[in-house]
């Protein structure tokens, strides 16, 4: 018996179609995914094959306009509208708190909604009592087939769940269900997950029972010969892990933001064994033409985004100071604004220890692309935002060896002076450089803001010591040079939509006045 | 609206079997369980077994195997179950109900048939 | 099998009372517990699933709770109607398997 597992994860409110890099599509020939050119590939291979489930691993919610103004809203509609067959909850579906989770998509999805390892509890319980699963059997063709769910126990860290979800082991949580699962006599068991690509494969090795693991998270890109894009695979699609009792268990992930649908196919014998798989990722190019019917939705439902981003946020008292002349060279309020809305935008009090759980940031200078002038009645809406932010990323956040900081600040002024944008604006740290010494031994004074302390003061920076960090996913990445975060972050997890977070910052202040109040310094 | 609709009141004797229909109707018959459980006179409820019209699977209490059969016949959203080798104490009213495949709780029951075993 | 163990067995109580059914499993159900009530000559009505989710149109005065293998039925304010027998059931393990039944009477 062949099911086709069709996939999708860390969507990120790319309901329209992009360019390449995932940001704003410019040039509509050559712009990639959206939902609208994602049905017409389902649909077309629900008419050619026989049993098919699509599925969604998790974090529609954040990263675009449209989740800013729809709130969860769109993903359910479009969601449903494309039939989805299960999703899984990922950290981002918390963002909006448990509320924001619950009224605009749990309410209103017509598709199963998926997680073993959340367990309500309190008040919240019988609020929430049946909106999501720990799993779901499908009815495909003459057989079920089993779809048991999962999403990051840091899920506390990353977003905003509130204190009555407690998130569980993901292993410890997942094997009773499978086995429940397994009474039922359901013997095709895919768990549908949003813990990233490691715990993906932890497991297949780990849960018996489990036959496919279909995950997301880490936005891991697999694929089985020459890619069909930029992304470089971490590995063959499906990644085949051997499980303790000996089995073969395919894990599949499809990269990011609608750019691809996962394409695998798995083959049973008659006793629910895989016994064979093979697929790839399904590049969704302007070759696949966009379902008009669905464009046309997605259409109707733009016009409210186009009003949204002319309307004021908040106000400003002050020029906010996003000009290269400054970001590039010194601290520049903009700077310290944005970090600020980093730090405000993570606030997660988790443990009475630790007033909070990261109080750093860093920004590189040369993704702060335009000022914006108090004189226009200080007003700041997303269109003035969008112009200090353009590139549609995310501020993540990420754990790092005080060393790694240490080469990252010697890095930020290795060639001082030439405009260029690795120029580190900060927050929750104090700098000081000496441009007399030479590159790579410029930083005599790096201090940082304490977490563990009822009163936050600036200590000096210990080299041995981990470090959680808010930063854009340019620098995780190992953007404007970075390489060493990259090579040495010991743990990333992706963040809200930038904008989205300063909008969110601004909104709530309503009205700001950053100053440059000596973070940056040069002896 | 959902509604289970089961055949009337059998009196067979000890060795007989007996036959008793399910005709679902107000749902997709396919895509739920049919479960059937009995109450003997002044007892409690024993569940006897499951089938999932979708497939024809089906899931039996130990204690019955052999002796119950279910089958379903989906032109009609029929669902039957046969119960063979009476004895006094198979005496009982037995009950349809539907259940979802995943979660056997049971959300809609049939009115109830009356089976007396009698020599 | 899963052994589900209900008390008391029978209660007497007056209109207005507040009434507490108990139910322990033999193991732990993860959960998988539904309440039911049954009137004289009729089929079993579902209350609650999942130990607290109420069906639609049952009254809110009927509330589950509990984990691992102790759950509880509570009536806050009994009302006439709601004389009957009540029986749990668990759902995690087959055979699925109620509990022995409570018989509530008017006092």
């Known amino acids: 018996w062949e099911l086709t597992i069709l996939h999708t994860n860390d969507v990120h409110s790319r309901l329209e179609q992009t360019s390449e890099d995932s940001s704003k599509c410019v040039n509509a020939s050559r712009c990639m995914g959206g939902v609208a050119r994602l049905f017409t590939k389902v649909q077309q291979i629900r008419r050619a094959e026989p049993n098919v489930l699509l599925l969604d691993a998790g974090d529609q919610y954040q990263g675009t306009i449209w989740f800013t103004v729809y709130k969860g809203a769109e993903v359910a509609h479009f969601m449903n509208a494309l039939r989805y067959d299960a999703m899984a909850l990922g950290n981002h579906e918390f963002d909006n708190g448990v509320e924001g989770l619950i009224e605009p998509l749990l309410k209103e999805a017509k598709f199963p909604i998926l997680s073993a390892n959340i367990k309500a509890k309190g008040p919240l319980a019988s609020q929430i009592s049946g909106l999501y699963l720990p799993y779901k059997v499908l009815p495909v063709g003459d057989e079920v087939v089993g779809i048991v769910g999962y999403t990051s126990k840091e899920t506390p860290f990353l977003s905003n769940p509130g204190t009555n979800l407690v998130f569980e082991d993901e292993i410890t949580a997942l094997q009773p269900e499978v086995d429940k699962l397994k009474t039922l006599n359901v013997n095709k068991i895919i768990a549908l997950g949003h813990s990233g690509f490691e715990m993906d494969k932890l497991i297949a090795q780990k849960v018996r029972g489990v036959d496919v693991v279909v995950g997301g998270h880490s936005n891991t890109f697999l694929y089985t010969g020459n890619p069909p894009s930029k992304e470089v695979p971490a590995g063959k699609y499906p990644f085949i892990v051997t499980s303790d009792d000996g089995r073969k268990v395919p894990v599949v992930q499809a990269y990011a933001f609608g750019k691809y649908l996962g394409y695998l196919k798995i083959e049973f014998d008659e006793r629910g064994n895989v016994i064979s798989s093979h697929g790839n990722p399904i590049l969704l190019n302007s070759s696949i033409p966009e379902d008009p019917s669905i464009k046309a939705d997605i259409n109707k439902w733009r016009i409210k985004l186009d009003n949204y981003s002319t309307q004021e946020l908040g106000k400003t008292i002050v020029y906010l100071d996003g000009s290269s002349q400054s970001c590039r060279f010194r601290e520049c309020n903009m700077g310290n604004l944005i970090c600020d809305a980093m730090i405000n935008n993570n606030l997660r009090h988790t443990d009475e220890m630790f007033w909070n759980h990261v109080s750093m940031c860093i920004l590189n200078g040369g993704g702060i692309r335009s000022p914006i002038d108090e004189r226009n009645n200080g007003t700041i809406t997303w269109e003035n935002l969008a112009a200090v932010l353009p590139f549609g990323g995310t501020f993540d956040l990420v754990q790092l060896k005080g060393s790694t900081l240490k080469k990252a600040f010697e890095h930020s002024v290795h060639r001082y002076g030439q405009s260029t944008g690795e120029f580190l604006q900060v927050g929750g740290i104090h700098v000081v450089y000496d441009l007399s010494r030479k590159p790579g031994d410029r930083v005599v004074k790096l201090d940082v803001l304490c977490t563990k302390c009822r009163v936050p003061s600036y200590d000096p920076l210990k080299m041995d010591e981990v470090y959680k960090v808010i930063l854009p996913n340019f620098l995780a990445n190992g953007g404007d040079g970075f390489q060493m975060i990259k090579d040495e972050l010991l743990r990333h997890d992706s963040g809200d939509q930038d904008i989205n977070v300063v909008s969110t910052y601004i909104s709530k202040m309503k009205v700001i006045y950053p100053a440059v109040e000596g973070r940056i310094k040069f002896s | 609206q959902v509604q289970l609709v089961q055949s009337g009141a059998e009196v067979k004797k000890p060795g007989a079997s007996v036959k008793v229909s399910c005709k679902a109707s107000?749902?997709?018959?396919?895509?739920?369980?049919i479960h059937w459980v009995r109450q003997a006179p002044g007892q409690g409820l024993e569940w006897m077994g499951a089938?999932?019209?979708?497939?024809?699977?089906?899931s039996y209490n130990q204690k019955f195997k052999g002796r119950v059969t279910m089958t379903v016949d989906t032109s009609t959203s029929t669902v039957y179950m046969e119960l063979s080798s009476l004895r006094s104490e198979d005496t009982a009213v037995y009950y349809c109900?539907?259940?979802?495949?995943?979660?056997?709780?049971?959300?809609?029951w049939g009115q109830g048939t009356l089976v007396t075993v009698s020599s | 099998d899963i052994q589900m163990t209900q008390s008391p067995s029978s209660l007497s109580a007056s209109v207005g009372d507040r009434v507490t059914i108990t139910c322990k499993a033999s193991?732990?159900?993860?959960?998988?517990l539904a309440w039911y009530q049954q009137k004289p000559g009729k089929a079993p009505k579902l209350l609650l699933s999942?130990?607290?989710s109420l069906e639609t149109g049952v009254p809110s005065r009927f509330s589950g709770s509990g984990s691992g293998t102790d759950y509880t039925l509570t009536i806050s304010s009994l009302q006439p109607e709601d004389f009957a027998t009540y029986y749990c059931?668990?759902?995690?393990?087959?055979?699925?398997?109620f509990g022995g039944g409570t018989k509530v009477e008017i006092k």
């Open positions: 999942g130990v607290i």
């Open positions: 109900a539907r259940g979802d495949y995943d979660e056997s709780y049971f959300d809609y």
């Open positions: 089938i999932f019209p979708g497939n024809g699977h089906i």
């Open positions: 107000g749902y997709t018959f396919t895509t739920y369980n």
């Open positions: 059931q668990q759902y995690w393990s087959i055979p699925w398997t």
């Open positions: 193991e732990g159900i993860y959960n998988r």
